[in-house]
């Protein structure tokens, strides 16, 4: 499109230059050319001459009509055929856009990643609008009644420095575009309840040479949070089924978790944590791959029914991955295995 054009006349759009997708649209062209009584007025859309639904209203004005216009963007211009002129003469041009009013933002979530210094809020925007849509995030203190507002496109990071007057807030998101406005539901936020511990990392793994070999996985986090609840999930790279082991962790030292695994197999491990009793999980850590050593004696191994030595383990569950061919794109498919945890974070992609 063209932002500024010297018009020798006017072009206007009904119902307007931005309209709801699927509406009927009329575009008018009115010439004000000197020394020209146009034989014809022509319309072009994105540089292509239009042939149909054009009406000459009078000597200076013509209209083109579109039934159910559904292109998100188009550049329209019109020209005149002046007697004695070899080329058509430009009259005017306009950018037009069609789209939808915004949906009400849904699934509003706010978290504070430990050490980040920010509260990060995300939401689902709903169906595409095709036009410029902005989101206004309202953050209102429940203690001082003071309200702050932040403009965003898809998420917002709010410095915790600007949230020092209070611990309890009401957060909601307003979606705004040329065709409408919608508000999300309000979210009650207590800053102490939304902290996600600093990232957990699996640093190494080793398999012992015992009669019954065991694999020890070492993992750590720089979190300062004292009570942390973690899950480690693991599976062979050829398998679709994850096993999940739960731990109460204390990161003042490196965590060691023991597993009795299938010998001579390649395993993928991942860990994630949350502050004990809170709802927000870390994303799963990067996949850590470990090869177990070859077995000496024959035995049928079933990792999920083996005895676990680690005293803090609580339960082991099974979850199926989407594809056995793509270990980097594994997903938790079921939230039912987590007793008492909300579904938040259970659909976190890896990789």
């Amino acid at each position: 499109g063209i932002t500024s054009i010297n018009c020798s006349g006017d072009m206007w759009v009904e119902p307007g230059e931005i309209f709801q997708m699927g509406m009927n649209v009329s575009i008018y062209c009115q010439e004000a050319l000197k020394h020209c009584r146009p034989r014809n007025l022509y319309f072009y859309k994105n540089g292509f001459k239009e042939e149909f639904d054009i009406t000459r209203i009078n000597r200076t004005t013509a209209r083109i009509w579109y039934k159910g216009f559904s292109e998100p963007h188009a550049y329209m211009h019109c020209t005149a055929e002046c007697p004695g002129h070899f080329q058509e003469t430009l009259i005017c041009g306009k950018d037009i856009s069609s789209g939808h009013p915004p949906d009400a933002p849904s699934n509003l979530t706010c978290v504070i990643y430990e050490y980040s210094g920010n509260m990060t809020c995300t939401w689902n925007t709903g169906k595409p609008t095709y036009i410029d849509t902005k989101y206004i995030v309202h953050v209102k203190s429940l203690e001082t009644e003071e309200e702050q507002q932040y403009l965003a496109s898809s998420y917002v990071k709010i410095s915790t420095d600007s949230l020092q007057g209070s611990r309890k807030y009401l957060v909601w998101v307003q979606a705004v575009n040329s065709l409408g406005m919608e508000n999300s539901q309000q979210l009650h936020v207590h800053l102490d309840d939304i902290v996600i511990p600093s990232a957990s990392i699996i640093s190494r793994a080793e398999t012992t040479n015992d009669t019954v070999p065991k694999t020890i996985v070492y993992w750590k986090s720089k979190t300062m949070i004292e009570k942390v609840f973690c899950e480690m999930r693991y599976k062979t790279t050829t398998n679709q089924t994850w096993s999940v082991k739960e731990f109460d962790a204390n990161f003042t030292y490196v965590q060691q978790s023991e597993f009795y695994l299938e010998p001579d197999s390649k395993y993928v491990f991942q860990v994630r944590c949350q502050e004990t009793g809170k709802r927000n999980w870390q994303p799963w850590s990067s996949p850590f791959v470990h090869q177990t050593s070859q077995e000496t004696g024959k035995r049928n191994w079933q990792p999920w029914s083996s005895p676990f030595v680690h005293q803090t383990s609580q339960t082991v569950s099974q979850v199926t991955a989407k594809s056995s061919h793509e270990p980097q794109k594994m997903e938790m498919l079921s939230a039912t295995i987590f007793r008492g945890h909300p579904a938040s974070g259970n659909h976190q992609d890896i990789g």
Epitope: I136, E147, Q148, Q149, Y150, L151, A152, S162, V176
Partner: nanobody, 116 residues
């Protein structure tokens, strides 16, 4: 209490420019989102533009590409730069707290008249 005082309006020819100011006091300006609204003769209030505390901006379609909103936290002042003015921009301009909305809190406003 919150006080807002607009200035900078005047009479200008079509295609001309103006810079409106809004001096703010009585609240923490640097943490506040602000907006401009206007009221043309015989018409209702119309939201024009908004800015948040970090400088992110939003504009009404009718002024996009011609008007620029900004704020100077050191001076507790909100600005609206009006370029390529049209006769339909003639209105009383008001500033208010908050990014978006077609209301204002009773400040006296500043008159912009675009006429040849």
């Amino acid at each position: 209490q919150v006080q807002l005082q607009e200035s900078g309006g005047g009479l200008v020819q079509p295609g001309g420019s103006l810079r409106l100011s809004c001096a703010a006091s009585g609240f923490t300006f640097r943490l506040s989102a602000m907006r401009w609204v206007r009221q043309a003769p015989g018409k209702g209030l119309e939201w024009v533009s908004g800015i948040d505390s970090r400088g992110s901006t939003i504009y009404a379609d009718s002024v996009k590409g011609r008007f620029t909103i900004s704020k100077d936290n050191a001076k507790n002042t909100l600005y609206l730069q009006l370029n390529s003015l049209k006769t339909e921009d003639t209105a009383m301009y008001y500033c208010a707290q908050g990014v978006y909305g077609d209301t204002y809190s009773g400040s006296q406003g500043t008159q912009v008249t675009v006429s040849s």
